[in-house]
Amino acid sequence: EVEKTACPSGKKAREIDESLIFYKKWELEACVDAALLATQMDRVNAIPFTYEQLDVLKHKLDELYPQGYPESVIQHLGYLFLKMSPEDIRKWNVTSLETLKALLEVNKGHEMSPQVATLIDRFVKGRGQLDKDTLDTLTAFYPGYLCSLSPEELSSVPPSSIWAVRPQDLDTCDPRQLDVLYPKARLAFQNMNGSEYFVKIQSFLGGAPTEDLKALSQQNVSMDLATFMKLRTDAVLPLTVAEVQKLLGPHVEGLKAEERHRPVRDWILRQRQDDLDTLGLGLQG
């Protein structure tokens, strides 16, 4: 907290400019008008203020907007955003994707901070759903974003947004998340033809039920082992040896290298040895 002191004669700031970097903290407090700061926030980032000086500027904005900053100020916060606490951010009402992008840019290259997580949460809740443009933006900055959401949060993703999802965005998703996303992907890609459909749906198959895997096995899709290893155990177990052979095509030989790992191990254990022997891979049930 900076003490209230009168501004020295001739030091009253008429605009936010480089001369302010020479002001002591108390001078910034006394000589910079909060309303002026709010209207010229876009200039702050061009000026090499110290962290201590930024604390003073934040304090002035907090006094001016005790109920939370308006979006016109938020959009131009720049590095001052790093000074905000999750509690500060919870007071905001961010509706513009441009504002979101501007603030994410400040944190670019770093892991998702509690501040960023709160900002995203406020933004998505304000929109009511995770639309395609928002998802595009968030996964561009944080490829793991989708998998950081709970199954409940993922349920608000409309099928149309699924087009924005790239395979790497699903790398860290667990089965419960894929259980929610798979039906949405199935709906989003339903009008595509066989081979194109498989390319798109492949990343989501960790949420696919047995009947969909059986259907895919009839379409010569040649699923790779990496995808097969991500399938739900309960979906894989009922598949016959013939169905797995058709599903994997030439990749079926890869089962040998994965025979000690789930879900391959669980599947092998539940097959008749005679059937396994037809694969010629030496798999032991």
């Epitope: 667990d174 089965p175 309960d234 177990l237 000690r260 789930r262 669980d266 254990l269 539940r270 032991q284």
Partner: antibody, heavy 119, light 107 residues
């Protein structure tokens, strides 16, 4: 409600064979979704998985114990058993039998039986 | 074998505290990691399976997260009955392995 109960001698002499049986009640050892494991815990130490068996008779053992372990299943008695040969004092532990439900983990455990290896 | 390294090996906490226990696998275990609670003289009890799924009947203050090699068990608000030893376990590889355990004691 599936329950497991271990039984067997509490004292075994060094170099002899430890034999334990686990009786499954309230469910079938022939369950499609379950394998049946033995796990042990030396006094004051952590848990060590010994091995599992499926009702078909297929087994999988801890590599460090494999040469001394045999797990078998008797579907008619709804039981599975553990034999550990050439025991030493290092095999003194509480021995648990547990159900490994394929979609979760060791979700049902016996209460455990203490086995001491001593002459 | 996949080695499971748990940390810390013990911790002291108060009722109401948020407690986090971590488990690191020596190689990827995908999401096939389970968490157990064990009280003295009792058999372990399954809390979390498949890294993040809550076992039926387990209080919602317990949660799990992680995939690959790094996994976390969190107790959001420690209760008196939660003082116990916690173990992680991987079942991805056929040779199942447990972590060394974390003893949660009263501060």
């Amino acid at each position: 409600q599936v329950q497991l109960q271990e039984s067997g001698p509490g004292l075994v002499k060094p170099s002899e064979t430890l034999s334990l049986t686990c009786t499954v009640s309230g469910g079938s050892v022939s369950s499609y979704y379950s394998t049946w494991s033995w796990i042990r815990q030396p006094p004051g130490k952590g848990l060590e998985w010994i091995g599992y068996i499926y009702y078909s008779g297929s087994t999988n053992y801890n590599p460090s114990l494999k040469s001394r372990v045999t797990i078998s299943v008797d579907t008619s008695k709804n039981q599975f058993s553990l034999k550990l040969s050439s025991v030493t004092a290092a095999d003194t532990a509480v021995y648990y039998c547990a159900r490994d439900f394929v979609l979760s983990g060791f979700d049902i455990w016996g209460q455990g039986t203490m086995v001491t290896v001593s002459s | 074998d996949i080695q499971m390294t748990q940390s810390p090996s013990s911790l002291s906490a108060s009722v109401g505290d948020r407690v986090t226990i971590t488990c690191r696998a020596s190689q990827s275990s995908r999401y096939y990691v389970n968490w157990y609670q064990q009280k003295p003289g009792k058999a372990p009890k399954l809390l979390i399976y498949a890294a993040s799924s809550l076992q039926s009947g387990v209080p919602s203050r317990f949660s799990g997260s992680g995939s690959g090699t790094d996994f976390t068990l969190t107790i959001s608000s420690l209760q008196p009955e939660d003082f116990a030893t916690y173990y992680c376990q991987q079942s991805y590889d056929a040779s199942y392995t447990f972590g060394g355990g974390t003893k949660v004691e009263i501060k």
